[in-house]
């Protein structure tokens, strides 16, 4: 990018530059006509018969450098060929010299600085590539010479450019003074400001475009070269913020449209909102869940919105004494999630009718909550109680939902309590063929013992056919028809209105070997 400091082609008024010395044959400001037939202000000098060593100087007005360290001067000029000038002396030249002088203000006068090299700084001696000679008629009078020179380094507020003629017949058609700067550049969502190079290469820090954030790593920078070009170099730049995507060749971040989102900064484009979510505004980093749908705290921002599951179905209960096995089917609606678990709530009602949450004497296997499989075993049920179990299905968003959690209930009533096991059996009399037994009356919680069942078999004879039963209404019994000198295993259970209680521990008894021993009371 070039920034113009002076362009005589654009000047319409007289330039009124300073010449030295004030003599005939000096530089003269004239109107000219360029290749495009535009009128331009020019300076011409044509003193080809001067005395050797006599110089004609022309100096521009003061030009502020506007921060430029190196300034370029493009000169367009024509020059007559010495050979085609019959009266040209040996001092005729086809070159001229360019100088500059720096100052902090427009302080030069007609006589100062002294018109010589040092204080003026020589830039170059310029030779014409194309020489003008007389042409027939209206032919082009000769090609224009174009030369670009480099001034600097400059340090003061401004400068003058000066031209020294020592015997040429030439016209300065235009002077363009400019400096080069690296144009504002946006690359990889990073904006690099317009920069005037102060050295061969200058590092320039970039800043993220609107709605972009710096990428991790070193902050982005580019190098501005002295020729006004950015040095090619990969840029780790910036990336669009959440809710924005790169656009227009990675020079802008554009807000995600309604119905789309972008959850993270970085590359990638806006995506349609996931299931059960929406974005009603532009620039959404996250889509809002529809009413009744949620995202768990651990869900990614781009995850679909989900809802709590429906209730489990078809709870089946199998009561076994004080144990209960519950089993159910998965809910019809999982809510769109995989993290399904089950939990149970329990209420118990006493036979009298008062109800309360289940006490701590119940145990749940594997547990009352966080169940992964659709079953549970409940132990420690009390007899003659009615239990209500509510089975709920839960997932990762159940805790976010308000309102009642759907459940599938099941009611289970336990049997009334049977008598406890009869364990303290005594042998009161023994003979070779019989045994008389007695036991303590068990305390039956649900009414009196109605009768007892005695179960016995010879030791070693384990099959079902060898087991014999005897019912008695008293808390004693006589076992007859036994083998002589044999060992028997005896168990007793009591029956109340609630049913039979469990058999007690096996009691070991032995019959007599012969009659002479008679009845003998045996204590267990």
């Amino acid at each position: 990018l070039e920034e113009t400091l002076l362009n005589t082609k654009l000047e319409t008024a007289d330039l009124k530059w300073v010449t030295f010395p004030q003599v005939d044959g000096q530089w003269e400001e004239l109107s000219g006509l360029d290749e495009e037939q535009h009128s331009v202000r020019t300076y011409e000098v044509c003193d080809v018969q001067r005395a050797p060593g006599q110089a004609h100087w022309l100096r521009t007005g003061w030009v502020p450098r506007r921060g430029a360290v190196h300034v370029y001067a493009t000169l367009r000029f024509t020059m007559l060929e010495c050979l085609s000038l019959p009266r040209a002396g040996r001092s005729c030249k086809e070159t001229f010299t360019v100088f500059y002088y720096e100052s902090d203000a427009d302080t030069a006068t007609a006589l100062t600085p002294a018109w010589m090299e040092n204080p003026y700084i020589k830039v170059d001696t310029v030779a014409a590539e194309h020489l003008t000679r007389k042409r027939p008629g209206a032919e082009a009078t000769g090609k224009v010479n174009v030369k670009t020179l480099r001034l600097g380094p400059l340090s003061k507020a401004g400068f003058y450019l000066a031209f020294q003629d020592q015997g040429a017949c030439m016209a300065l058609l235009s002077l363009h003074l400019f400096y080069k700067k690296c144009a504002q550049l946006t690359v990889n969502l990073t904006r690099f400001p317009e920069t005037v190079p102060r050295e061969l290469v200058v590092p320039v820090a970039g800043s993220c475009v609107v709605d972009a954030v710096p990428a991790p790593g070193p902050s982005p920078s580019l190098y501005c070269r002295e020729d006004g070009q950015w040095a090619e170099q990969p840029v780790t730049g910036c990336s669009c913020a959440p809710g924005f995507e790169a656009a227009e060749g990675n020079t802008k971040c554009r807000a995600c449209a309604q119905g789309t989102f972008k959850p993270l900064s970085g590359e990638g484009s806006c995506q349609p909102c996931p299931a059960n979510s929406h974005s009603n505004t532009i620039g959404s980093a996250v889509c809002q869940c529809r009413v009744g749908y949620f995202r768990a705290r651990t869900d990614p921002r781009g995850a679909p919105c989900t809802t709590p599951p429906s209730a489990p179905r078809s709870v089946v209960s199998r009561l076994n004494g004080s144990s209960l096995h519950l089993e159910w089917s998965a809910p019809l609606e999982s809510g769109g999630r995989e993290d399904l678990t089950y939990a149970l709530r329990c209420r118990e009602c006493r036979p009298g009718g008062s109800c309360a949450p289940c006490g701590g004497d119940l145990t749940f296997d594997p547990g009352p909550r966080d169940l992964v499989e659709p079953w549970v075993v409940v132990r420690g049920l009390r007899p003659d109680f009615t239990y209500t179990f509510e089975v709920t299905a839960l997932n990762g968003v159940s805790s976010l939902a308000t309102g009642p959690v759907p459940f599938e209930p099941v009611n289970v009533t336990t049997d009334r309590e049977v008598p406890p096991a009869v364990s303290d059996i005594r042998v009161t009399r023994s003979s070779p063929s019989s045994l008389s037994l007695a036991w303590a009356v068990p305390r039956a919680p649900s009414g009196a013992v109605l009768d007892y069942e005695v179960k016995y078999h010879e030791k070693g004879a384990e099959g079902p056919s060898s087991v014999r039963f005897l019912k008695t209404s008293e808390n004693r019994a006589e076992l007859r028809g036994l083998k002589r000198g044999a060992s028997y295993l005896v168990q007793v259970r009591a029956r109340s209105e609630a049913g039979y209680g469990p058999f007690g521990q096996e009691h070991h008894s032995q019959t007599q070997l012969d009659e002479s021993e008679g009845w003998r009371e045996q204590l267990a």
Epitope: T78, L80, L85, R87, G137, A140, T141
Partner: antibody, heavy 126, light 107 residues
């Protein structure tokens, strides 16, 4: 503004010569084209020839070839037109005119004449 | 020499009229054609050069066009001071030539 001042009116005999001068005041002279144009009474303009002083030699209209000589003196910024073997039909007003641009400051030599002298009446009569 | 033929040789017009004068060259002269205005007893005045370039200080009602052999000078709205003789002038050759002139008179 440059002025071209021509010499005064002349009365000449047929067969004689006349030399009309044209002095340019102020500024560059050598690189402009100076043309000579005549106008007989009640007639149109007639180009006779032109010179770019720095180059020395002049171009002439075929009609006047051999009879007219155009010269320039750079030191005095004066151009001259000499017409010989005068005839009565050479009675006319003779103008000098300068081109709009120098040979160095225009890309094409349009020889457009934007500065004219006041004219010199030359009468050829026996 | 290249011959320049102007037409018409004279014309009558009123103030405000649009006036067109043509000039034809005997051979191609590209755009190397100038137009002049001359009033009685005065030196000619340059109006247009390079076929269409308006000389500085000349009113914009004057315009020129053409290239090659056919050229036109147009006065878009004739003013009282425009009554004069108009000449075309070719500079393509080493030998310049003028047209014979067109006299613009008051109707």
């Amino acid at each position: 503004q440059v002025q071209l001042v021509q010499s005064g009116a002349e009365v000449k005999k047929p067969g004689s010569s006349v030399k009309v001068s044209c002095k340019a005041s102020g500024g560059t002279f050598s690189t402009y084209a100076i043309s000579w144009v005549r106008q007989a009474p009640g007639q149109g303009l007639e180009w006779m020839g032109s010179i770019i002083p720095i180059f020395g030699d002049a171009d002439y209209a075929q009609k006047f070839q051999g009879r007219v000589t155009i010269t320039a003196d750079e030191s005095t910024s004066t151009a001259y037109m000499e017409l010989s073997s005068l005839r009565s039909e050479d009675t006319a007003v003779y103008y000098c005119a300068r081109s709009s641009y120098t040979i160095l400051t225009t890309y094409y030599n349009y020889n457009a004449m934007d500065n004219w002298g006041q004219g010199t009446l030359v009468t050829v009569s026996s | 020499d290249i011959q320049m033929t102007q037409s018409p040789s004279s014309l009558s017009a009123s103030v405000g009229d649009r006036v067109t004068i043509t000039c034809r060259a005997s051979q191609n002269i590209n755009n190397f054609l100038n137009w002049y205005q001359q009033k009685p007893g005065k030196a000619p005045k340059l109006l247009i050069y390079g076929s269409s370039i308006l000389q500085s200080g000349v009113p914009s009602r004057f315009s020129g066009s053409g290239s090659g052999t056919d050229f036109t000078l147009t006065i878009s709205s004739l003013q009282p001071e425009d009554f004069a003789v108009y000449y075309c002038h070719q500079v393509s050759d080493t030998s310049d030539t003028f047209g014979q002139g067109t006299k613009v008179e008051i109707k």
